[in-house]
């Protein structure tokens, strides 16, 4: 297992809300990607393939979620002080070989100015 | 523990159908990929068929197509193959196999775990 | 289809010898999606390796693969009794994915 810090802005805050980034390499074809607080597992996004170029999406833990061809962007939504934490995007490479597992993660500050709904 | 348990072989006439069932235990199904591969009676490995996670891809060999279907009930824990218009050549030990890594893919990925596999006899 | 084809068919050697095994593909096999299986008498085959050189969970460290393209090598660096078996090498790169027709290592 590979650990590291995001090399890249991992979090994007808008309207209240933020949307976490979680990047794999372009050659990667099939994958699981977990969105990590801490230990806990907050949501995951399978992306694989199979005959005819078919590609399946699964999520077993539903999110608000977007893929890209190199991204996976979780979104958390009525950001309050109690989502300041860790997060840590959790890849897992099924496709090409060999089988990986890399941690990458940041923490995310949680600021008046990023509140929904703040009462002036 | 991993379990696979194939049944539902047996012996019987060419043009005949039969329907195999592959039942999984000791891992969460739904994860995984699977895949028929079979064994000619001293021969050597065949791939048949593959399914990914919800069913909804599936693939077979040239030889196969057309007369095998592949199906799983996720909810039973199961694996099917219905087999028909059967041929002498189709005499083998069947084997459901499950993909390595669980990425829910029987496509390029390698298998772990076999079953013991069920005999299909065809035969006049 | 990609064809694979395995030599030797037979390879005698005793306890504490090396064994390589070879497989070569009619063509190219993509990102290496290749594996070796062992298959002993009246048993389901067991993964060894996939990814032509990755030790899959549990395999003695006796075990490695090799190579790329349509050139690959199973490696046993120093046969153990229970190693005695059929090997057969599997591509599931390209649809319809194959098996070779094995090698069988045996007591010399």
């Known amino acids: 297992e590979i650990n590291g810090s995001a090399n890249y802005e991992m979090f994007i805050f808008h309207n209240g809300g933020v949307q976490i980034l979680c990047k794999y390499p372009d050659i990667v074809q099939q994958f699981k990607m977990q969105l990590l607080k801490g230990g806990q597992i907050l949501c995951d996004l399978t992306k694989t393939k199979g005959s005819g170029n078919t590609v399946s999406i699964k999520s077993l833990k539903f999110c608000h979620s977007q893929l890209s061809n190199n991204s996976v962007s979780f979104f958390l939504y009525n950001l309050d002080h109690s989502h300041a934490n860790y997060y840590f995007c959790n890849l897992s490479i099924f496709d090409p070989p060999p089988f990986k597992v890399t941690l990458t993660g940041g923490y995310l500050h949680i600021y008046e100015s990023q509140l929904c709904c703040q009462l002036k | 523990e991993v379990q696979l348990v194939e049944s539902g072989g047996g012996v019987i006439r060419p043009g005949g159908s039969l329907r195999l069932s592959c039942a999984a235990s000791g891992f969460t199904f739904d994860d995984y990929g699977m895949s028929w591969v079979r064994q000619a009676p001293g021969k050597g490995l065949e791939w048949v068929s593959g399914?990914?996670?919800?069913?909804?891809?599936?693939d077979y060999a040239d030889s196969v197509k057309g007369r095998f279907t592949i199906s799983r009930d996720n909810a039973k824990n199961s694996l099917y193959l219905q087999m028909n218009s059967l041929r002498a050549e189709d005499t083998a030990l069947y084997y459901c196999?499950?993909?390595?890594f669980g990425s829910g893919s029987y496509y390029n990925v390698p298998f772990d775990y076999w079953g013991q596999g069920t005999l299909v006899t065809v035969s006049s | 289809e990609i064809v694979l084809t395995q030599s030797p068919g037979t390879l005698s050697l005793s306890p504490g010898e090396r064994a390589t095994l070879s497989c070569r593909a009619s063509?190219?096999?993509?990102?290496?999606?290749l594996a070796w299986y062992q298959q002993k008498p009246g048993q389901a085959p067991r993964l060894l390796i996939y990814g032509a050189s990755s030790r899959a969970t549990g395999i003695p460290d006796r075990f490695s693969g090799s190579g790329s393209g349509t050139d690959f090598t199973l490696t046993i660096s120093r046969l153990e009794p229970e190693d005695f078996a059929v090997y057969y090498c599997?591509?599931?790169?390209?649809?319809?994915?194959?098996f070779g027709p094995g090698t069988k290592v045996d007591i010399k």
């Open positions: 399914i990914n996670w919800i069913g909804d891809n599936t």
């Open positions: 196999a499950r993909d390595y």
């Open positions: 599997h591509q599931y790169g390209n649809s319809p994915f194959t």
């Open positions: 063509q190219s096999v993509s990102s290496s999606y």
